[in-house]
Structures are given as structure tokens and as C-alpha cells.
């Protein structure tokens, strides 16, 4: 059998491999050792017994989308049946005091691979034996502690495979410089040690995306905006736009990044090298926000101009691809996809990212101020309570609701929250009466709200001890 027979449904073409050469990966035309690594089709009854106590689930994730030329990282995590975990030695053990369907296990081990390798590893002194090999026959790399790595992961994409020895979690990074743009499929097959051979325990696949557009996300924040996710904001208050570039492999770390903004309100283009920008809309309405991000990223060098035509044709390269990141020689000789590399040449290519949003601008409460606090006369039967009137003004639209949150002096521990509808005149002047139980210092957060906005002001007030002989206290 060949790798593509085992790992995929259809034989990938050489064209696919040639156009997506992954550094350090091998062609899936290579032979697969079926004696050591048996192949089971979906639905084969043997899957039922491939793991003690249930089925192992493999979870494959990636940090896709990846900007072409950057690295994309795939992570595989194995999820064992209930009550099972991997210990420090790479053995699979039952968790203490954990009950599964079979009850508590007397044997602490699900798989004790350490004991097996110590007892029965008939090796020739070199630490290498005929069974410590990958499906294509390559020997396991002898990293420190490799004997505690009991899972073999075979990654397969674009007609190529990559083999990795690992524990219950592995990561593989792939450079995408030569990967065709668009969605691609990564498939992973996982085997476990089983005596002097291996047993398949899980298969998983996931789609990843390679793009030549910088993946851009923009967060928008505005003070007093009630719902930051509805793309409705308030007139006459600055909106803070923060650009997040998805670049987990830090491919653009050394790039100068330019941000070109068009806010859609006839204020022209704004160009910046800062990822945050503030903009205030002064009219109500719907506006089309456009952002273009430009970065000079490492990239292939353009082909040299064709030389003047010689009288006798000279051989030239089928492909001109000067890669910024690899000194690995390309296929040699008469391969139709020979790669030319100039190691010292560092070429750059402009990459762009785009973000577009439709923003609605409406009236909102822009500001709220407490202009006066007045003690209210209380009858003597309630000596512990104080009533205080807060006289509040606001700017912008007319509020429909007022809330007061009374807390401790640090403003962290809420003691009391009261919200009530309000009916305010055009001047936006209102009085809010609140009760304070006992003397002391209080933090008062007062918010005025309407459908789209929520404006806040805070103050610390000090309520003095109540003197029964003086029913009235002066205003603060």
C-alpha cells in the first residue's frame, strides 16, 4: 500500500504536490508498512477494541487562516475515555477515585508502556530496533525521553505526509509559502504502541485556509454606547477603532503596516501606522466604513526579465521561485518544476487586508453630571436612614431610564441597585432621590439610559451620623 491509499480517498496528483511543496514533508506515493501499521477501513469491527475502555477521540485544530508565506500550526489533542489520563512517563493510567461504567479499577494502568519497553525491547545496543520506525520505515528520532512517547501521528495534506512521535498532544507547523490559496484539507491518523507493532486509535480531519489577504478584525468601542456589537454608535462622541491582525506566527513582525481608513462621511482618507484610531461622526445616518491594511511581507522574488534571445536555445528554469525562508534544494535535474533559490536575496511583496462595515449613527446621551446633592428632611422614626436628592443634568438625547448603584467606598461591592423610568423635559434636568442606610462613605454610580446609549457618572458621598435632635442636615 502507498500512503495515499491509507490516508486519503483518492490518489493526489503530482501537480498538487509540485504546486504545494511543504518543507520536510514526503510524497504520499511512498510505501506504507502495513505489517507494522495495520490499516482499518471505517466501520471495521477492530476499531471497537483499539483502546481499552472505549474510543479515543482526536481533536484537530489550527490557527488558520494563514497569510501565504507564514507558518500555520496544527495541534492534535487526544481525549481518552472517562477516568483515563497520560502520566509523566507517557503511560495511560486510571485517575484516582474516578468511577466509570466498569467501577473503580484495581490495576492503575490502562497501558503500561514503560514496563513493556523495559521487558521486551530486544535491541541491538544502538537503541534502535526494527519496530521503532514510522510507517514509511524511517527510524524514530531519539530525543531525550522518546521512549515515553507512545503515539504516532501521521499528518496528510496536499499529497504529502509528515510523521511525528508524540504524547497525547502534538503540534506541527507548516510553512505556507508554496501552498495554493483557498481551503485545504488536513487529515491526521493516530496509532498507539502495541507490543512490537502499532494499532490505529483515531482519525480526524479539518479544513484550513491559506490566503493572500491579511486577516483583519476590527473592534469598535465608544463611551456611552449601550451595545458595542450592533454597529450602532452615537453622534458627537469619538469611536475607538482597534485593528487586530491575525498573525499567530508573527510573519508580519518586521513589516511596516499601514492603515488606510475611509469613514464614509466625506472626511476623506486617513492614513496611519497606528493600529488604533479615533473618529467622531457629527451627523446621524448610515455610513460605510472601509479599512485597507498594507504590509510589505517576505515573499518570492519576481522572475528576472527574460535574457535577449540567444542564437542557440539555452536551458532555463521551468519555475522561478526564490524563497525567503528555505535553503532546501528543490527537485533537481529534469524535473519540470525545478526551483531556483537565491539564498541572499530577500524579496518583499505587498500584502493587503480589507475590512468593511456599515455603521449607523444615532443621537445618544453624551454626558451626565450631578450638579447638586441635597439632604432630605426625614421624620424621627427612621433615625438610621438618610434620603438624598441628586440633581442631574445631561447632554444629548433625552434619557428614558435612570439607575443608581450604591457601593462601598472602593466602588467594588454593590450594596443596592435601583432602576426606574424617567420622564425628562427638553432641558434634561432631573432629580433622583435615593435612600442610604446608615452613615459612612458611599460610592454612587448614576447612569442615564435610552435605547442606544448609557451614560455614567460616579461620585463619593459621605453620610454623617444622624443626630436625632437635628432632623435636617445641610446639603453636601
Amino acid at each position: 500500500k502507498r500512503f495515499h491509499d491509507v490516508l486519503g480517498n483518492e490518489r493526489p496528483s503530482a501537480y498538487m504536490r509540485e504546486h504545494n511543496q511543504l518543507n520536510g514533508w514526503s510524497s504520499d506515493e511512498n510505501d506504507w508498512n502495513e505489517k507494522l501499521y495495520p490499516v482499518w477501513k471505517r466501520g471495521d469491527m477492530r476499531w471497537k477494541n483499539s483502546w481499552k475502555g472505549g474510543r479515543v477521540q482526536a481533536v484537530l485544530t489550527s490557527d488558520s487562516p494563514a497569510l501565504v508565506g507564514s507558518n500555520i500550526t496544527f495541534a492534535v489533542n487526544l481525549i481518552f475515555p472517562r477516568c483515563q489520563k497520560e502520566d509523566a512517563n507517557g503511560n495511560i493510567v486510571y485517575e484516582k477515585n474516578c468511577r466509570n461504567e466498569a467501577g473503580l479499577s484495581a490495576d492503575p494502568y490502562v497501558y503500561n508502556w514503560t514496563a513493556w519497553s523495559e521487558d521486551s525491547d530486544g535491541e541491538n545496543g544502538t537503541g534502535q530496533s526494527h519496530h521503532n520506525v514510522f510507517p514509511d520505515g524511517k527510524p524514530f528520532p531519539h530525543h531525550p525521553g522518546w521512549r515515553r512517547w507512545n503515539f504516532i501521528y501521521v499528518f496528510h495534506t496536499l499529497g504529502q505526509y509528515f510523521q511525528k512521535l508524540g504524547r497525547c498532544s502534538v503540534r506541527v507547523s507548516v510553512n505556507t509559502a508554496n501552498v495554493t490559496l483557498g481551503p485545504q484539507l488536513m487529515e491526521v491518523t493516530v496509532y498507539r504502541r502495541h507490543g512490537r507493532a502499532y494499532v490505529p486509535i483515531a482519525q480526524v480531519k479539518d479544513v484550513y485556509v491559506v490566503t493572500d489577504q491579511i486577516p483583519v478584525f476590527v473592534t469598535m468601542f465608544q463611551k456611552n454606547d449601550r451595545n458595542s456589537s450592533d454597529e450602532t454608535f452615537l453622534k458627537d462622541l469619538p469611536i475607538m477603532f482597534d485593528v487586530l491582525i491575525h498573525d499567530p506566527s508573527h510573519f508580519l513582525n518586521y513589516s511596516t503596516i499601514n492603515y488606510k481608513w475611509s469613514f464614509g462621511d466625506n472626511t476623506g482618507l486617513f492614513v496611519s501606522t497606528n493600529h488604533t484610531v479615533n473618529h467622531t461622526y457629527v451627523l446621524n445616518g448610515t455610513f460605510s466604513l472601509n479599512l485597507t491594511v498594507k504590509a510589505a511581507a517576505p515573499g518570492p522574488c519576481p522572475p528576472p526579465p527574460p535574457p535577449p534571445r540567444p542564437s542557440k536555445p539555452t536551458p532555463s528554469l521551468a519555475t522561478t521561485l526564490k524563497s525567503y525562508d528555505s535553503n532546501t534544494p528543490g527537485p533537481a535535474g529534469d524535473n519540470p518544476l525545478e526551483l531556483s533559490r537565491i539564498p541572499d536575496e530577500n524579496c518583499q511583496i505587498n500584502r493587503y487586508g480589507h475590512f468593511q462595515a456599515t455603521i449607523t449613527i444615532v443621537e445618544g446621551i453624551l454626558e451626565v453630571n450631578i450638579i447638586q446633592m441635597t439632604d432630605v428632611l426625614m421624620p424621627v422614626p427612621w433615625p438610621e436612614s438618610s434620603l438624598i436628592d441628586f440633581v442631574v443634568t445631561c447632554q444629548g438625547s433625552i434619557p428614558t431610564e435612570v439607575c443608581t448603584i450604591i457601593s462601598d467606598p472602593t466602588c467594588e461591592i454593590t450594596q443596592n441597585t435601583v432602576c426606574s423610568p424617567v420622564d425628562v423635559d427638553e432641558m434634561c434636568l432631573l432629580t433622583v432621590r435615593r435612600t442610604f442606610n446608615g452613615s459612612g462613605t458611599y460610592c454612587v454610580n448614576l447612569t442615564l439610559g435610552d435605547d442606544t446609549s448609557l451614560a455614567l457618572t460616579s461620585t463619593l458621598i459621605s453620610v454623617p451620623d444622624r443626630d436625632p435632635a437635628s432632623p435636617l442636615r445641610m446639603a453636601n
Epitope: 496528483s13 509540485e18 490559496l181 493572500d212 518570492p300
Partner: antibody, heavy 119, light 107 residues
Framework: QVQLQQPGAELVKPGASVKLSCRAS????????LHWVKQRPGQGLEWIGE????????NYIEKVKTKATLTVDKSSSTAYMQLSSLTSEDSAVYYC????????????WGQGTLVTVSA | DIVMTQSHKFMSTSVGDRVSITCKAS??????VAWYQQRPGQSPKLLIY???YRYTGVPDRFTGSGSGTDFTFTISSVQAEDLAVYYC?????????FGAGTKLELK
């Protein structure tokens, strides 16, 4: 919908050069390799080469490497094939065609440009 | 280079007939073979890709089969509009190559 637009015809003198264009629309230009195919009058189809619009990588058949040069202009989503030192052997219809991602079959073809090399 | 050989340059048929066109590759290209139809004065049109997959919108009277080096394109019931030249193409490796074409004509 996907379209590849090519001019109908070019008349050129022997020894001269010609630059054929193929304007793409209806898809993300940089996401697919573009290919050029030659068809001499009454003859079959012959693949000439391909270009990756994203980064300019190219592949050619051996015999046209000194004859054809493939380029792209991303800003106008246009691919070009320059043919130099033209002879009567180069008189043909030249098609541009788009491949299907990682697969080199052609679901989309231009109408073709008839190049006539004549004194 | 991979050579694609279409053994018949011409094939005579009648409307309603079943007709099969063969294509032989000089090496194993399975399953990377496509079939195109070209009517006079028109661009080629993709019918089948990866040996047996019918392209979107292609009538189901057109089918493809084969593996390894031998591939067959079949029209189950020829219609008048099917009279054209049919080309096989290997999309297995560069340089991409076409067969010489088979012209389907009326008896």
C-alpha cells in the same frame, strides 16, 4: 460569474513580439493559477504554461521557455503572455484558462485570441 | 512528458447511439484525467474531471471511467449537438498534456 476576456485577434509581422491579454472577473484573481493553451488551425490543444497570480510563480513547457513570458497585473486582474521572435509556427489561437484550485483541469476558458504572423 | 493517445481521430455515429472514446496514458496518471468537448469556432468545454466526475451542469449522458493508464469517455445516447471534437487531458503532472482529439461525426 467567472469570465476570462481575451481580444479576438492580433496580426503581427515575423520577428516581432506580441503581448496577449486575459482579463479575469467574477472570482478572486490571486486564488487560482492561470494557464495558456495553444491551438494551431485544425490541430489539437497544447499546454504552454501557467502563472500563479498571487506571487508570479511560473511553469512552461520546455520548448517555449525562450519564446513565451507570462506575467500578471493584479490591480487589473489581467494575465499576459508575451510571445517573441514570432514565426509562422506561432500562428494559432491562444486560450487562457483557469484551473480548479489544486487541480489542473480547466472549467473556465477565454474565447481565445487568434494570432496571425504574416509579412 | 506524459503522452496521451486517443486511438481514433474520427468516429462515426448516429443520433441515439452509444459511443465510447478511449485514451491511453504513457504512465499511470490515475485518476487525473479530464475530458473536453470543442465545437467548431468555440473554446473547449470541461465535461469530466478526475476520470469520472461530471462537471456541474453537464448532462448525465456523458460519463467517464478508467484507471491507471486506460480511460474511457462515453456518451450513452448521442444527440445532434454532441457532434464535436473530444479531447482527453492528463492533469496528473506538469507539463499538462492533451490527446490529439477524436472527432465525432454523423454516419
Amino acid at each position: 460569474q467567472v469570465q476570462l476576456q481575451q481580444p479576438g485577434a492580433e496580426l503581427v509581422k515575423p520577428g516581432a513580439s506580441v503581448k496577449l491579454s486575459c482579463r479575469a472577473s467574477g472570482y478572486t484573481f490571486t486564488s487560482y493559477w492561470l494557464h495558456w493553451v495553444k491551438q494551431r488551425p485544425g490541430q489539437g490543444l497544447e499546454w504552454i504554461g501557467e502563472i500563479n497570480p498571487s506571487d508570479g510563480r511560473t511553469n512552461y513547457i520546455e520548448k517555449v521557455k525562450t519564446k513565451a513570458t507570462l506575467t500578471v497585473d493584479k490591480s487589473s486582474s489581467t494575465a499576459y503572455m508575451q510571445l517573441s521572435s514570432l514565426t509562422s509556427e506561432d500562428s494559432a489561437v491562444y486560450y487562457c484558462a483557469r484551473s480548479g484550485g489544486n487541480y489542473a483541469w480547466f472549467a473556465y476558458w477565454g474565447q481565445g485570441t487568434l494570432v496571425t504572423v504574416s509579412a | 512528458d506524459i503522452v496521451m493517445t486517443q486511438s481514433h481521430k474520427f468516429m462515426s455515429t448516429s443520433v441515439g447511439d452509444r459511443v465510447s472514446i478511449t485514451c491511453k496514458a504513457s504512465q499511470d496518471v490515475s485518476p487525473s484525467v479530464a475530458w473536453y468537448q470543442q465545437r467548431p469556432g468555440q473554446s473547449p468545454k470541461l465535461l469530466i474531471y478526475s476520470a469520472s466526475y461530471r462537471y456541474t451542469g453537464v448532462p448525465d449522458r456523458f460519463t467517464g471511467s478508467g484507471s491507471g493508464t486506460d480511460f474511457t469517455f462515453t456518451i450513452s445516447s448521442v444527440q445532434a449537438e454532441d457532434l464535436a471534437v473530444y479531447y482527453c487531458q492528463q492533469h496528473y503532472s506538469i507539463p499538462l498534456t492533451f490527446g490529439a482529439g477524436t472527432k465525432l461525426e454523423l454516419k
